[in-house]
């Protein structure tokens, strides 16, 4: 029950996280301009990964997409790549985790297969979350660097023909959305990995049934011959819980791939 809950919660948390990563990637407010007034009127500029927008104090907004002519910084391209990789990995992870959910029955899928799928999706969510956090952090670093550069270099000129105004850019809403979303995806991934441990078949907690073959006294139980002869190594010195009764099965084998009901 706890495993199902952990897996389900991990899935939901990751789903919210990935939705957030997608939202952050599409948002225009990655960098917003520090309050700056043009001598004429207040026109604010805010920029995303894909386009730049200007907004008047009246609320009128115009956005234009970046074009190759601008020679965008390599860092921006890297941020775009990280966010897209994060989304793709997250989407695949979601798809895998749907089939891995314990509450969903698909044919005669074994628990071991579900455990593997849960682990796979968990790892994908963790990497997806890390990609998003890395992407947002790289952009934030660009902003901080730009902020101090523009503070130090207030006015530059080409014979008075160009004037770099105090247009310092600060963290936009998308950065916070990205950080939170990346964190949620990461947490969801960890939860899926934890759930995987609970899903993975462990040592059996039932009494093995002894079948006496004519000639040799050999006890067979699910898990193969090596576990049934009574000569196996007993490094763990564990006993199967049997409510106090003793059986001839005192030697506990290591769990094998098929050691479950």
């Amino acid at each position: 029950m706890a495993v199902t809950a952990c897996q389900g919660l991990g899935f939901v948390v990751s789903l919210i996280g990935i939705a957030g990563i997608i939202a952050a990637t599409c948002m225009d407010q990655w960098s917003t301009q520090d309050l700056y007034n043009n001598p004429v009127t207040a026109v604010f500029n805010y920029q995303g990964l894909w386009r730049s927008c200007v907004r008047e104090s009246s609320g009128f907004t115009e956005c234009r997409g970046y074009f190759t002519l601008l020679g965008l910084p390599a860092m921006l391209q890297a941020v775009r790549a990280l966010m897209i990789v994060g989304i793709v990995l997250g989407a695949i992870g979601l798809l895998v985790s749907i089939f891995a959910l314990k509450c969903i029955r698909i044919g005669s899928m074994e628990d071991s297969a579900k455990a593997n799928m849960t682990l796979t999706s968990g790892i994908m969510f963790i990497v997806s979350g890390l990609c998003a956090i890395a992407g947002v952090s790289v952009f934030a670093n660009m902003l901080v660097t730009n902020f101090w550069m523009s503070t130090a270099n207030m006015y530059t000129g080409m014979g008075g023909m160009v004037q770099t105004v105090q247009t310092r850019y600060t963290f936009g809403a998308a950065l916070f959305v990205g950080w939170v979303a990346g964190g949620l995806t990461l947490i969801g991934g960890v939860m899926m990995c934890i759930a995987c441990r609970g899903l993975a078949p462990e040592e059996t907690n039932y009494k093995a049934v002894s079948y006496h073959a004519s000639g040799h006294s050999v006890a067979y139980k699910p898990g193969g011959f090596k576990a049934s002869t009574g000569f196996g190594s007993n490094t763990k010195n564990k006993k199967i819980y049997d409510g106090g009764a003793r059986t001839e099965d005192e030697v506990q084998s290591y769990p094998s791939k098929h050691d479950y009901v």
Epitope: N45, S52, V54, M142, S150, V165
Partner: nanobody
Framework: QVKLEESGGGLAQAGGSLRLSCAAS????????MAWYRQTPGRQRELVAA???????DYADAVKGRFTISRDSAKNTVYLQMNDLKSEDTAVYYC??????????????WGQGTQVTVSS
């Protein structure tokens, strides 16, 4: 990066008209504001008229009702229609553009200026 090309200046009679135009070219992402300033010898540069990307306009009190600023966003061009010219309108008119040129880059550019002379 961004070049502002002014045209339309010259000599005009008092009460006459002139139309100035300023075309912005180069690496332009968004033009936030385009404006016209003027400067007479010994005086500071003063704002004449300005227009935002959304079409909001602002005029100096001395030119209100006589001058009209307009823009063509597609051509990144701003126009200043000057009617009922007075001798005090004689000055060098400068085009100004507040431009977003790239990621985290917003600069103010100035044109070379065009002379407007009003004879009485």
């Amino acid at each position: 990066q961004v070049k502002l090309e002014e045209s339309g200046g010259g000599l005009a009679q008092a009460g006459g008209s002139l139309r100035l135009s300023c075309a912005a070219s180069g690496r332009i992402l968004n033009i936030a504001v385009m404006a016209w300033y003027r400067q007479t010898p010994g005086r500071q540069r003063e704002l004449v008229a300005a227009i935002t990307f959304g079409g909001s306009t602002d005029y100096a009190d001395a030119v209100k009702g006589r001058f009209t600023i307009s823009r063509d966003s597609a051509k990144n061009t701003v126009y200043l229609q000057m009617n009922d010219l007075k001798s005090e309108d004689t000055a060098v008119y400068y085009c100004n553009a507040d431009v977003v040129t790239g990621l985290m880059r917003r600069d103010v550019y100035w044109g070379q200026g065009t002379q407007v002379t009003v004879s009485s």
